[in-house]
């Protein structure tokens, strides 16, 4: 297929970097400048991204591959390849429409995207609550109340060394 | 009807300077992506130099830049390449170009002119 392709479709030959120039007799033409084609046999460039504003280049464009952007710091990528620059916020905070707002009681996040989250609610589990959650933190649960009954330990002491050539007792 | 007229072409001893200019007619060289390709014997197009946006950011080939200066006119509706420091590698046919967007998102590019040839040679 491919070679019957390239017998009927000149432009089957022009390579990435190039286009298949109509007005030329369909010679390979090189992309203008700001333009790429990053596969063969096209019938024209496309038109480089533009990393502006809250946006900065992470890649040149090149005549075969499109320039790739990222954020300027303060903000973060959302969408695919970057579409979008988003605000950072602290942790303990979500981004809404008017700014960075810190997390209700009983959420959080940890993080400088995304939205504040409930804490874990141990009980679901049959657990309780071991170390108290904050704004930025989850709750950390611990061991069930059962496991907590007087004599019970909730944490398992490590087997005390033995001496060599004692057997234990 | 888009039309690109080259001149100032001609032979040169390597180290030399030449001014390559295109007239324009039929469109706007300020509000128009313009510049100059070129075609050395036996190998393909490749592009020298633009002015690309009407802001009037320039582009260089690596093989030219700091030797070749691309301007323009507008009251002359004419563009032009300032050529210096001249190697025999710049032997070519010089063609004026005009950068085309195409509705769909495409870029190419015309030639309407019969280009003007550059020698450096001893």
């Known amino acids: 297929f491919e070679r019957t392709r390239s017998l009927q479709d000149p432009c089957s030959n022009c390579p990435a970097g190039t286009f298949c120039d109509n007005n030329r007799n369909q010679i390979c033409s090189p992309c203008p400048p700001n333009s790429f084609s990053s596969a063969g046999g096209q019938r024209t460039c496309d038109i480089c991204r533009q990393c502006k504003g809250v946006f900065r280049t992470r890649k040149e464009c090149s005549s075969t591959s499109n320039a790739e952007c990222d954020c300027t710091p303060g903000f973060h990528c959302l969408g695919a390849g970057c579409s979008m620059c988003e605000q950072d916020c602290k942790q303990g905070q979500e981004l809404t429409k008017k700014g960075c707002k810190d997390c209700c009681f009983g959420t959080f996040n940890d993080q400088k995207r995304g939205i504040c989250r409930p804490w874990t609610n141990c009980s679901l589990d049959g657990k309780s609550v071991l170390v108290n959650g904050t704004k930025e933190r989850d709750v950390v649960c611990g061991p069930s109340p059962a496991d907590l009954s007087p004599g019970a330990s909730s944490v398992t002491p490590p087997a005390p060394a033995r001496e060599p050539g004692h057997s234990p007792q | 009807e888009v039309q690109l007229l080259e001149s100032g072409g001609g032979l040169v001893q390597p180290g030399g300077s030449l001014r390559l200019s295109c007239a324009a007619s039929g469109f706007t060289v300020s509000a128009e992506d313009v510049g100059w390709v070129r075609q050395a014997p036996g190998k393909g197009l490749e592009w020298v130099s633009a002015i690309l946006d009407s802001g009037g950011s320039t582009y260089y080939a690596e093989s030219v830049k700091g030797r070749f200066t691309i301007s323009r006119d507008n009251a002359k509706n004419t563009l032009y390449l300032q050529m210096s420091s001249l190697r025999a590698e710049d032997t070519a046919v010089y063609y004026c170009?005009?950068?085309?967007?195409?509705?769909?998102?495409?870029?190419?590019?015309?030639?309407r002119g019969q280009g003007t040839q550059v020698t450096v040679s001893s």
């Open positions: 170009a005009r950068v085309v967007y195409h509705s769909g998102g495409g870029v190419t590019f015309d030639l």
